[in-house]
C-alpha cells in the first residue's frame, strides 16, 4: 500500500526537484503542531505568531491577549505558566539544558491583576524546577536540590528540604538514571489535587559510582563533568517519598510515605506518583529484577498526621515471560470513586489491554481485547473512557483515539478518528479539556499533519487549528519518495516494514539498500507518520530505498514478540533486520553489492553486530553513539531487558552481545562509527572501546567524534554528522558527488 | 485632559450593600489598572484593592476579601467597586486611581490620576 | 505588608521657608535589577483627591513646580518644599509601590506658621 503517492506527471516532471541535503539541514518541510495549553473546560491559552499570550473561549468564540510580548520581551522569556486563579503569570528565560529533560532557568513572576512584575521576595536563580499549584497561586520550586514553598508570589519562602547537595541528594527532582530511564521528567514533585499536600522524592546517591568525562570547552584546561550513573549492576540510588501539608508545613513537616513490605526487602525503585484526592494517594514500586510491580494505595490519617498504606490496597503486577509493562509499568486512571482505576496491562493471551481494577488484580474487568494493543489512556470522565490503540485495520503502526461509553452497559465502544481523513490520518494523539468538555486531536501522518478542535460530546470538529498550508504549498514542487507499510511472515513472525522508494521508482531497476535500524525494547520505528528526513532526501536525490523493520523486542504487537528477546539483548534484533534483507533481495529490486545499514543509539549497537554477523550482506555501515556492551549502560534500562551482570544471573550473555567480541568480522565492511564525546547517556567509552577492540585486531575502521556533544550530537554538529554519512554512504555505493 | 468620574454619595444601612462606578475619558483604558482607595474621617489612605481591563482580573487586599468585588465594563471604559456587609467604620471617601501597566520588568508606576472621591455613609 | 511611619504628623512653616517630611518603610523599596525606589508623594487638599507629585522616590510628575523635590532611597525617604508658598497648604502622603498591598503613610499636615 503506498501511503504517500509522489505527485509526478510527466507533464510536471520538468518543474519539480528533489530533496537536498540543505533542505533537512535548514528543516526546510518541518511541519507545526497545535497543542492547546487548555486551562479550563473550555478555555485554552496559545501563544500567538507575533508571541502575545492569548486566551481562547470556545463557547463564546472570544479571545484576548492575556500577557503582551512586550512583558514577554522584556525578560526574554520562551515559556511560560499562568497560575490556576489566573492572576500570575511565570515567565522562564535563561533557560540552560542539563539531560534530556532537565534543565535550569531564571522565573519571573508577573501579576495579570496589577499588570507589573512582582517584586520583593524573589525567586532565587537558577531553578531546577517551578510549578504552581493546581488551584490558587501556591509556588513550588526546587533551588540547589532543595524544596521551596510559596504560598504567593510575593511572599518570604518556606524551605521544606535541607539536606539537597549537588550530585548527593536530590529533592523533588531526579538524578540521572530516574531522569532518563523511569520518571521520564524533570521533576519528582506532586500536588495533590487541591494543593493541600505536596509529595516529592528523595533521592540518596551517595553511594553510586562516578561517570566522568571532559568537557573541553575554550579554557586552557578541560572541564571534568561527574555525573553519579549507576552501570548494570552497580549500587543505585535510594528513594523516598514524602508528602507536606502546604497549608501547614511547619506543623508536622514532611512525612515518609512507607513502601510495600514485599518490595522493601531487596533493592528497588518507585516509579509513578498519582493524587486520586487530596487525602489519597497512589505510587508504584517496583523490584530492581524489574518483574514484578507493586501498586499501593495510600490514605491521609488527620488523628496522626500520617500516610497509610494497608496491605489490601495493594495491587502486584508481575510478569513471568518478561519484564513488568512496556517500556515503563503503565500509570493507573482513577475513576470517580477514588478507589478503582483503569491500567493498561498483559491479558491472559498476551496483548497489553485496558483493565478495570475494582478490588483485587485478579478480579480485573477486561475492557479491551483483541490481538492489537491499547496504547494509551487519555482521559475518564463519568461516562467515557479515552484511548488510543493500534486496532484499526490491523496495522500495528497506526494510532487511532476511541471513546468507550462506561456510563452505559454494555459498554458501547467508537472510533472516533478512524474515519475522519482516512489516507491524510492514521496516526493521532490527543489532548483533553477539564471533563473532556473539548478535545484536540494533533494527526502526525501519514499525510501532512493536521491538528483539530472538537466537541468532546458529540465528537464533531470545531475547527483546525494547524494544517500546515505553508508546507503543503512548499512541497507541491518536491519530488518526495514514496513510502510503503507492509509486512512479511517469517518462521511464524510477523516483520512489518516501512519502505521508502525513490519518486521515479522502476522494480525492473535495481537500487542500493540502507537499513535504518532503532530495534531497541519496546520501541516501534514503523510508524504512519509524516516526515521529510535524512532518508527522505536520500531516496528522492541520491536514489536508495531505505527500509526501517520492525523485529522481535519492538512494541504494541503482543508479549510474545515484545518479550522474545528478554535476557537476550543483541540477538533477535539482529537476525531480524538481516532476515527482512534477505526477503527485500528476493524481491528483486535491490543491488545486493550495496545494501548498509546504520542506527543510533541502541540502532548503533544493532547496526554494529549487524555488520559484524558475519553474512556478507553489507557492504557498509555506520554506528551513532553506539552502546557497545551492556555493562556500560544504565542499570535500570539494562538490568530491566538483560537482569544482572553476575555469575548466578547472566553475566555469561553481558560478555556474548558485545560489539568488541565481534571486532575480526569487521574485515571485510566499511564501518564508521560517531559519537559525542560528552554523551551523558551512551557514554564515550562505549566507542573507546569499540575503537580499541579493532585496533587491536587491526581492522581498518572510518571514526568521527564530536568534541562536547552529546547523545543528540546537536545544532553545527548535526550538519556535519549527516554531510559526513551522506558522503560515506555515497562512496560506499559508488554513487557520484 | 483625563477624566475619573465616581458616581454620587450613598447612605446605606449597616449590613447592605454599596456599588460605586468610576467611568474614565480621554485615555486608552486598556492601558492603565484601576485601583480603589478609601479614606475614613481622619484616617490615612486605605488601597482596597484593583483590576485589570485587560483580564478583569482583580487583586484584593486581604483585609477586604470576601467583601468587596471590582469589576470593569470595557465597553463604557468604567470600573465598579462593590463593598458588601457594611458596617459604620466603612464610612469613608472612596476613590479610583488609575495606574499605568508595567509591559516591562523594570517598569513600575504611581497612581498618576484619581477620581474626585464618591462618600459612602453607613448609619443606622 | 509593608508599613509606612511619617515624620512629622504636622508641620508649620513660614511662607517661603523649606519644608522637610520624612517617610520611613518597614522594608526596603530600592528594587536591586533597576536601583530605582518604588516610593511616591502625593499631596491632598482638602475636599480633594490626593494628587501625585514625586514617583519613584524623586522624579517630578509633570506640572508639578520644582520646588518640589524627593529624596531617599531604601528605607528612608524625604519631600523637601523649597520655599512654601501659600497652595502648598496640604496634607501629604508617601505611599510605596513595591509589593502589594500597596500602603500609605499616615499624611503629614503642611500648614503656615
Known amino acids: 500500500i503506498v501511503l504517500r503517492p509522489s505527485r509526478v506527471h510527466n507533464s510536471e516532471e520538468n518543474t519539480m526537484r528533489a530533496l537536498t541535503l540543505k533542505d533537512i539541514l535548514n528543516g526546510t518541510f518541518s511541519y507545526k503542531t497545535f497543542f492547546p495549553n487548555w486551562i479550563s473546560g473550555q478555555e485554552y491559552l496559545h501563544q500567538s505568531a507575533d508571541n502575545n499570550i492569548v486566551l481562547y473561549n470556545i463557547e463564546t468564540g472570544q479571545s484576548y491577549t492575556i500577557l503582551s510580548n512586550r512583558t514577554m520581551k522584556s525578560v526574554n522569556a520562551s515559556n511560560y505558566g499562568l497560575s490556576p486563579d489566573r492572576q500570575f503569570v511565570y515567565l522562564e528565560s535563561d533557560y540552560s539544558k542539563l539531560w534530556r529533560y532537565s534543565y535550569t532557568a531564571t522565573y519571573y513572576i508577573y501579576d495579570l491583576s496589577n499588570g507589573e512584575f512582582v517584586r520583593g521576595n524573589e525567586l532565587p536563580r537558577p531553578i531546577q524546577y517551578l510549578c504552581w499549584s493546581p488551584v490558587g497561586s501556591k509556588l513550588a520550586y526546587v533551588y540547589q536540590n532543595n524544596i521551596y514553598l510559596k504560598q504567593r508570589p510575593g511572599d518570604p519562602p518556606f524551605q521544606i528540604t535541607f539536606n539537597g547537595r549537588e550530585n548527593k541528594i536530590f529533592n523533588g527532582i531526579p538524578d540521572w538514571v530516574y531522569e532518563e530511564e523511569m520518571l521520564a521528567t524533570k521533576y519528582a514533585l506532586w500536588w495533590s489535587p487541591n494543593g493541600k499536600f505536596l509529595a516529592y522524592a528523595e533521592f540518596n546517591d551517595t553511594d553510586i559510582p562516578v561517570i566522568a568525562y571532559s568537557y573541553y570547552g575554550d579554557e586552557q584546561y578541560p572541564r571534568t563533568i561527574n555525573i553519579p550513573y549507576p552501570k548494570a549492576g552497580a549500587k543505585n540510588p535510594v528513594v523516598r517519598i514524602f508528602i507536606i501539608d502546604t497549608t501547614y508545613p511547619a506543623y508536622v513537616g514532611p512525612q515518609e510515605v512507607p513502601v510495600p513490605a514485599m518490595i522493601a526487602s531487596s533493592d528497588y525503585y518507585f516509579s509513578w506518583l498519582t493524587w486520586v484526592t487530596d487525602e489519597r494517594v497512589c505510587l508504584q514500586w517496583l523490584k530492581r529484577v524489574q518483574n514484578v510491580s507493586v501498586l499501593s494505595i495510600c490514605d491521609f490519617r488527620e488523628d496522626w498526621q500520617t500516610w497509610d498504606c494497608p496491605k489490601t490496597q495493594e495491587h502486584i503486577e508481575e510478569s513471568r515471560t518478561g519484564w513488568a509493562g512496556g517500556f515503563f509499568v503503565s500509570t493507573p486512571v482513577f475513576s470517580y470513586d477514588a478507589i478503582s482505576y483503569y491500567k493498561i496491562f498483559s491479558d491472559k493471551d498476551g496483548y497489553k489491554h485496558i483493565h478495570y481494577i475494582k478490588d483485587t488484580v485478579e478480579n480485573a474487568i477486561q475492557i479491551t481485547s483483541g490481538k492489537w494493543e491499547a496504547i494509551n489512556i487519555f482521559r475518564v470522565t463519568q461516562d467515557s473512557l479515552f484511548y488510543s490503540s493500534n486496532e484499526f485495520e490491523e496495522y500495528p503502526g497506526r494510532r487511532n483515539i476511541y471513546r468507550i461509553s462506561i456510563g452505559s452497559y454494555p459498554p458501547s465502544k467508537k472510533c472516533v478518528t478512524c474515519h475522519l481523513r482516512k489516507e491524510r490520518c492514521q496516526y493521532y494523539t490527543a489532548s483533553f479539556s477539564d471533563y473532556a468538555k473539548y478535545y484536540a486531536l494533533v494527526c502526525y501522518g501519514p499525510g501532512i499533519p493536521i491538528s483539530t478542535l472538537h466537541d468532546g460530546r458529540t465528537d464533531q470538529e470545531i475547527k483546525i487549528l494547524e494544517e500546515n498550508k505553508e508546507l503543503e504549498n512548499a512541497l507541491k514542487n518536491i519530488q518526495l519518495p514514496k513510502e510503503e507499510i507492509k509486512k512479511l511472515e517469517v518462521d511464524e513472525i510477523t516483520l512489518w516494514y516501512k519502505m521508502i522508494l525513490p519518486p521515479q521508482f522502476d522494480r525492473s531497476k535495481k537500487y542500493p539498500l540502507l537499513i535504518q535500524v532503532y530495534g531497541g525494547p519496546c520501541s516501534q520505528s514503523v510508524r504512519s507518520v509524516f516526515a521529510v528526513n535524512w532518508i527522505s532526501y536520500l531516496a528522492s536525490k541520491e536514489g536508495m530505498v531505505i527500509a526501517l523493520v520492525d523485529g522481535r523486542g519492538t512494541a504494541f504487537q503482543g508479549d510474545k514478540l515484545l518479550y522474545a528477546v528478554y535476557r537476550k539483548l543483541g540477538v533477535y534484533e539482529v537476525e531480524d533486520q538481516i532476515t527482512a534483507v534477505r526477503k527485500f533481495i528476493e524481491m528483486g529490486f535491490i543491488d545486493e553489492k550495496r545494501i548498509a545499514i546504520w542506527g543510533w543509539s541502541y540502532g548503533g549497537y544493532v547496526s554494529s553486530l549487524a555488520l559484524a554477523s558475519g553474512t556478507g550482506l553489507f557492504k557498509c555501515g555506520i554506528a551513532v553513539a553506539p552502546v557497545s556492551s551492556w555493562e556500560y549502560y544504565a542499570s535500570v534500562y539494562t538490568e530491566r531487558f538483560m537482569g544482572l551482570p553476575t555469575k548466578d544471573d547472566n553475566l555469561e550473555h553481558y560478555k556474548n552481545s558485545t560489539v568488541m567480541a565481534r571486532a575480526e568480522y569487521f574485515r571485510n565492511v566499511d564501518y564508521l562509527l560517531i559519537h559525542g564525546t560528552a554523551d551523558d547517556n551512551v557514554h564515550f567509552q562505549n566507542s573507546a572501546q569499540i575503537a580499541k577492540a579493532l585496533v587491536n585486531a587491526q581492522v581498518d575502521f572510518q571514526a568521527m567524534w564530536y568534541s562536547d556533544q552529546n547523545h543528540g550530537l546537536s545544532g553545527l554538529s548535526t550538519n556535519h554528522l549527516y554531510t559526513h554519512m551522506t558522503h560515506f554512504l555515497k562512496q560506499c555505493f559508488s554513487l557520484s558527488d | 485632559q483625563v477624566q475619573l468620574v465616581q458616581s454620587g454619595a450613598e447612605v446605606k444601612k449597616p449590613g447592605a450593600s454599596v456599588k460605586v462606578s468610576c467611568k474614565t475619558s480621554r485615555y486608552t483604558f486598556t492601558e492603565y489598572t484601576i485601583h480603589w482607595v478609601r479614606q475614613a474621617p481622619g484616617q490615612r489612605l486605605e488601597w482596597i484593592g484593583g483590576?485589570?481591563?485587560?483580564?478583569?482580573?482583580?487583586n484584593y487586599n486581604q483585609k477586604f476579601k470576601g467583601r468587596v468585588t471590582i469589576t470593569v465594563d470595557t465597553s463604557a471604559s468604567t470600573a465598579y467597586m462593590e463593598l458588601s456587609s457594611l458596617r459604620s467604620e466603612d464610612t469613608a471617601v472612596y476613590y479610583c486611581?488609575?495606574?499605568?501597566?508595567?509591559?516591562?520588568?523594570?517598569?513600575?508606576?504611581?497612581?498618576?490620576?484619581w477620581g474626585q472621591g464618591t462618600l459612602v455613609t453607613v448609619s443606622s | 505588608d509593608i508599613v509606612m511611619t511619617q515624620s512629622p504628623d504636622s508641620l508649620a512653616v513660614s511662607l517661603g521657608e523649606r519644608a522637610t517630611i520624612n517617610c520611613k518603610s518597614s522594608?526596603?523599596?530600592?528594587?536591586?535589577?533597576?536601583?530605582?525606589?518604588?516610593l511616591a508623594w502625593y499631596q491632598q487638599k482638602p475636599g480633594q483627591p490626593p494628587k501625585l507629585l514625586i514617583f519613584w522616590a524623586s522624579t517630578r510628575e509633570s506640572g508639578v513646580p520644582d520646588r518640589f523635590s524627593g529624596s531617599g532611597f531604601g528605607t528612608d525617604f524625604t519631600l523637601t518644599i523649597s520655599s512654601l508658598q501659600a497652595e502648598d497648604v496640604a496634607v501629604y502622603y508617601c505611599?510605596?509601590?513595591?509589593?502589594?498591598?500597596?500602603?500609605f503613610g499616615q499624611g503629614t499636615k503642611v500648614e503656615i506658621k
Open positions: 486611581a488609575r495606574r499605568r501597566i508595567a509591559y516591562g520588568y523594570d517598569e513600575g508606576h504611581a497612581m498618576d490620576y
Open positions: 522594608q526596603s523599596l530600592l528594587y536591586s535589577r533597576n536601583q530605582q525606589n518604588y
Open positions: 483590576i485589570n481591563p485587560n483580564n478583569g482580573i482583580p
Open positions: 505611599q510605596q509601590y513595591f509589593s502589594y498591598p500597596l500602603t
